[in-house]
């Protein structure tokens, strides 16, 4: 004979656990239904009545199956140095990430709390380590034989051009200038 299907709420077997998408209610001492993402518990279960769920209100969400009495508040609107990469819905929080040219100086669980502009390496310095979503650019002085003549968060030190005859020798912030030889 097939095992009898238990409908919530039900008392679990001694030492047993509740099924997926159920929780053990310590007051009712029953296995009761959780609420799906986008909803919350409006009425907790009793020994004879199951959990009653309700939709999250505007600007609130639940991402997981839950039995919370209130949905979580979505984070505040994204600031001017950020872009909204995920909107606030009943099932997910708003996610703000830094716009191009910026990195996250202070992160939060999802997205970024505080963005900062990526460092620009001045002439004579090139990018040693590029900026990422969560780290700033690292600059380094251009080594002999290399140069950077820009103020940039992306340019690396480039080798001087090789001349047959050098008119002006290159340095860390300027390329070499070659003499043009006439035929």
């Amino acid at each position: 004979l097939p095992a009898q299907v238990a409908f919530t709420p039900y008392a679990p077997e001694p030492g047993g656990t509740c099924r997926l998408r159920e929780y053990y209610d310590q007051t009712a001492q029953m296995c009761c239904s959780k609420c799906p993402p986008g909803q919350h518990a409006k009425v907790f279960c009793t020994k004879t009545s199951d959990t009653v769920c309700d939709s999250c209100e505007d600007s609130t969400y639940t991402q997981l199956w839950n039995w919370v009495p209130e949905c979580l508040s979505c984070g505040s609107r994204c600031s001017s140095d950020q872009v909204e990469t995920q909107a606030c819905t009943r099932e997910q929080n708003r996610i703000c990430t830094c716009r191009p040219g910026w990195y996250c100086a202070l992160s939060k669980q999802e997205g970024c709390r505080l963005c900062a502009q990526l460092r620009k390496c001045r002439p004579g310095f090139g990018v040693a380590r590029p900026g990422t979503e969560t780290s700033d650019v690292v600059c380094k002085p251009c080594a002999p034989g290399t140069f950077s003549n820009t103020t940039s968060s992306t340019d690396i030190c480039r080798p001087h051009q090789i001349c047959h005859v050098v008119a002006i020798p290159g340095n860390a912030s300027m390329d070499a200038v070659c003499t043009s030889t006439s035929p």
């Epitope: 007051t27 409006k42 009793t46 020994k47 009545s49």
Partner: antibody
Framework: QVTLKESGPGILQPSQTLSLTCSFS??????????VGWIRQPSGKGLEWLAH???????YYNPALKSRLTISKDTSKNHVFLKIANADTADTATYYC???????????WGTGTTVTVSS | DIQMTQSPSSLSASLGDKVTITCKAS??????IAWYQHKPGEGPRLLIH???TLQPGIPSRFSGSGSGSDYSFSINNLEPEDIASYYC????????FGGGTKLEIK
């Protein structure tokens, strides 16, 4: 407007049964998620939860007093009753009834009724 | 049974002060705590539920916070009408009140 009002015997003798009535208006115990509970406060002491009944007649009792308590309701009359068997001088207190929300906290209380158990 | 240890049991403060009351549960109560104000001759009045949600009509001077087994309740800018006793209630597993805090004016 939600209101609750407690009534009781005022004075009774030890070993008698203490009977309390909570009369309420502004909500119905036919409504999903509604409940009414009893709480007491002996003079100069703190609050103690006693018992609770839900819209679906599910009942909960303070484990320390469970053997002496009986809670019931008359939904049509908007009444909830509490009986405490074998009353003792330690049961002298102000008794409150309160509405309980579906998420299990008391949100509106009555003003209380004083009960003295004395020989 | 869950025990609720509320402190202090009495508190004397001046008007305009900030006062804080704490409740410690004997186990995790998952934020299921409410705070009540109780004045003589009246029924208790609900101020806060689910740790920090202010009941409609309650001034924002009242606030609550906490998680797990440790919770606190604060009154900012104490006013004369705040003189009362205050109680926490855990409703995570059945219902248990803290012992109460009697708030007086210095």
């Amino acid at each position: 407007q939600v209101t609750l009002k407690e009534s009781g015997p005022g004075i009774l003798q030890p070993s008698q049964t203490l009977s309390l009535t909570c009369s309420f208006s502004g909500f119905s115990l036919n409504t999903l998620g509604m409940g009414v509970g009893w709480i007491r406060q002996p003079s100069g002491k703190g609050l103690e939860w006693l018992a609770h009944i839900w819209w679906d007649a599910d009942k909960y009792y303070n484990p320390a007093l469970k053997s002496r308590l009986t809670i019931s309701k008359d939904t049509s009359k908007n009444h909830v009753f509490l009986k405490i068997a074998n009353a003792d001088t330690a049961d002298t207190a102000t008794y409150y009834c309160a509405r309980m929300t579906g998420t299990r906290y008391f949100d509106v209380w009555g003003t209380g009724t004083t009960v003295t158990v004395s020989s | 049974d869950i025990q609720m240890t509320q402190s202090p049991s009495s508190l004397s403060a001046s008007l305009g002060d900030k006062v804080t009351i704490t409740c410690k549960a004997s186990q995790n109560i998952n934020k299921f705590i409410a705070w009540y104000q109780h004045k003589p001759g009246e029924g208790p009045r609900l101020l806060i539920h689910y740790t920090s949600t202010l009941q409609p009509g309650i001034p924002s001077r009242f606030s609550g916070s906490g998680s797990g087994s440790d919770y606190s309740f604060s009154i900012n800018n104490l006013e004369p009408e705040d003189i009362a006793s205050y109680y926490c209630l855990q409703y995570g597993v059945l219902w248990t009140f803290g012992g109460g805090t009697k708030l007086e004016i210095k």
